[in-house]
């Protein structure tokens, strides 16, 4: 089952998966000026059997003279970013990827790949947090988050990490800014069927879609 939400955001911290559980999807994104090949895949999938896991489907990009894109994200220069996983600024290897059965390694880059990687995690995925450069960690517990299924809904556990500036006085647990806990965040329930008339967010939030004609122009 896919995790509907992103891992929690910790101020001044980034997170990274060291290995990807079977079922994880990685979007096939191409850099500006390139697009997926015709009849290409929209994503790669971590798949496998009891003894071996690997990425199924190959992402392939080809040059395109015209691009039908909107809201293109402009990443920071020289920075490989990932949505739902973010590159660490320094190496962090709490887990040996090769030693985890049922997991895939970081997929190798493909030609003309976008500067961002968009992953879709599955239940059981673990991500690890680390403070960005210039901030130091105050640990109250594990600096990791796991996607769990509870009462038919997915949620990420809250990492016990505070990142404080090197020159700042350390925050004590009682003084920290409150973190939004996963329990307090809206979560989607994909088993709910679409409601087409009421689109206010309810206590039990359902994912919905509503279509309507926006404009009609006559030539």
């Amino acid at each position: 089952e896919l995790c509907d939400d992103d891992p929690p955001e910790i101020p001044h911290a980034t997170f990274k998966a060291m290995a990807y559980k079977e079922g994880t999807m990685l979007n096939c994104e191409c850099k500006r000026g390139f697009r997926r090949i015709k009849s290409g895949s929209l994503y790669m999938l971590c798949t496998g059997n009891s003894s071996h896991s690997s990425w199924d489907n190959q992402c392939q990009c080809t040059s395109s003279a015209t691009r039908n894109t909107t809201k293109q994200v402009t990443p920071q220069p020289e920075e490989q970013k990932e949505r739902k996983t973010t590159e660490m600024q320094s190496p962090m290897q709490p887990v040996d990827q090769a030693s985890l059965p049922g997991h895939c390694r970081e997929p190798p880059p493909w030609e003309n790949e976008a500067t961002e990687r968009i992953y879709h995690f599955v239940v059981g995925q673990m991500v690890y947090y680390q403070c960005v450069q210039g901030y130091r960690a105050l640990h109250r517990g594990p600096a990791e988050s796991v996607c769990k299924m509870t009462h038919g809904k997915t949620r990420w556990t809250q990492p016990q990490l505070i990142c404080t500036g090197e020159m700042e006085t350390s925050q004590f647990p009682g003084e920290e800014k409150p973190q939004a806990s996963p329990e307090g965040r809206p979560e989607s329930e994909t088993s709910c069927l679409v409601t087409t008339t009421d689109f206010q967010i309810q206590t039990e939030m359902a994912a919905t879609m509503e279509t309507s004609i926006f404009t009609t122009e006559y030539q």
């Epitope: 009849s39 968009i118 989607s188 994909t190």
Partner: antibody
Framework: PGASVKVSCKAS????????ISWVRQAPGQGLEWMGW????????NYAQKLQGRVTMTTDTSTSTAYMELRSLRSDDTAVYYC???????????WGQGTTVTVSS | DIQMTQSPSSLSASVGDRVTITCRAS??????LNWYQQKPGKDPKLLIY???SLQSGVPSRFSGSGSGTDFTLTISSLQPEDFATYYC?????????FGGGTKVEIK
């Protein structure tokens, strides 16, 4: 015929930018036809070859809305147009209620 | 493009019957196959994803099987609310394609 139509699809209840949106249409009495896909995260698109040049899909992340514009309408474009949250390997799990577009002279 | 061929195009069955619908892909799509149910005037509903995984909230009488090019949707004991049209769809590569549909009618 010859007109353009722009159909909107407003999503709620989930993180809009986490998934792509597929547009699917259904002509009267016919089956489902995939029109194309757009990444709600960065706007990357993939269109069905037969609609290339006539269709444009966009998103507005500030309102969690996807748009599908179809130009140079023909009578065979008469159909119910659906948007769906596309989870790839995990299927199109949430669908809009559909918008009927009738092209008549 | 990958063509999806469903059979039969329609069938008549009674409540309690075991119903089987098949879907064949023109080339191997591994397990990248989804099944949908659509009732007249309604939007499609996802039943099965990844060839055999039951979508949350879908009754367990629905099951899917297959891999490669041949896939099957089975309704173990047909209920009155199951009379509808069923579509398979491949999510292996673009363009995404649907089968022509199978209409399940009351005998």
């Amino acid at each position: 015929p010859g007109a353009s139509v722009k159909v909107s699809c407003k999503a709620s209840g989930y993180t809009f930018t986490s998934y792509g949106i597929s547009w699917v249409r259904q002509a009267p009495g016919q089956g489902l036809e995939w029109m194309g896909w757009i990444s709600a995260y960065n706007g990357n698109t993939n269109y069905a070859q037969k609609l290339q040049g006539r269709v444009t899909m966009t998103t507005d992340t500030s309102t969690s809305t996807a748009y599908m514009e179809l130009r140079s309408l023909r009578s065979d474009d008469t159909a119910v147009y659906y948007c769906a949250r596309d989870r790839g390997y995990y299927g199109m799990d949430v669908w809009g209620q559909g918008t009927t577009v009738t092209v008549s002279s | 493009d990958i063509q999806m061929t469903q059979s039969p195009s329609s069938l008549s069955a009674s409540v309690g019957d075991r119903v089987t619908i098949t879907c064949r892909a023109s080339q191997s799509i591994s397990r990248y196959l989804n099944w949908y149910q659509q009732k007249p005037g309604k939007d499609p509903k996802l039943l099965i994803y990844a060839a055999s995984s039951l979508q949350s909230g879908v009754p367990s009488r629905f099951s899917g099987s297959g891999s490669g090019t041949d896939f099957t949707l089975t309704i173990s004991s047909l209920q009155p609310e199951d009379f509808a049209t069923y579509y398979c769809q491949q999510s292996h590569s673009t363009p995404l394609t649907f089968g022509g549909g199978t209409k399940v009618e009351i005998k």
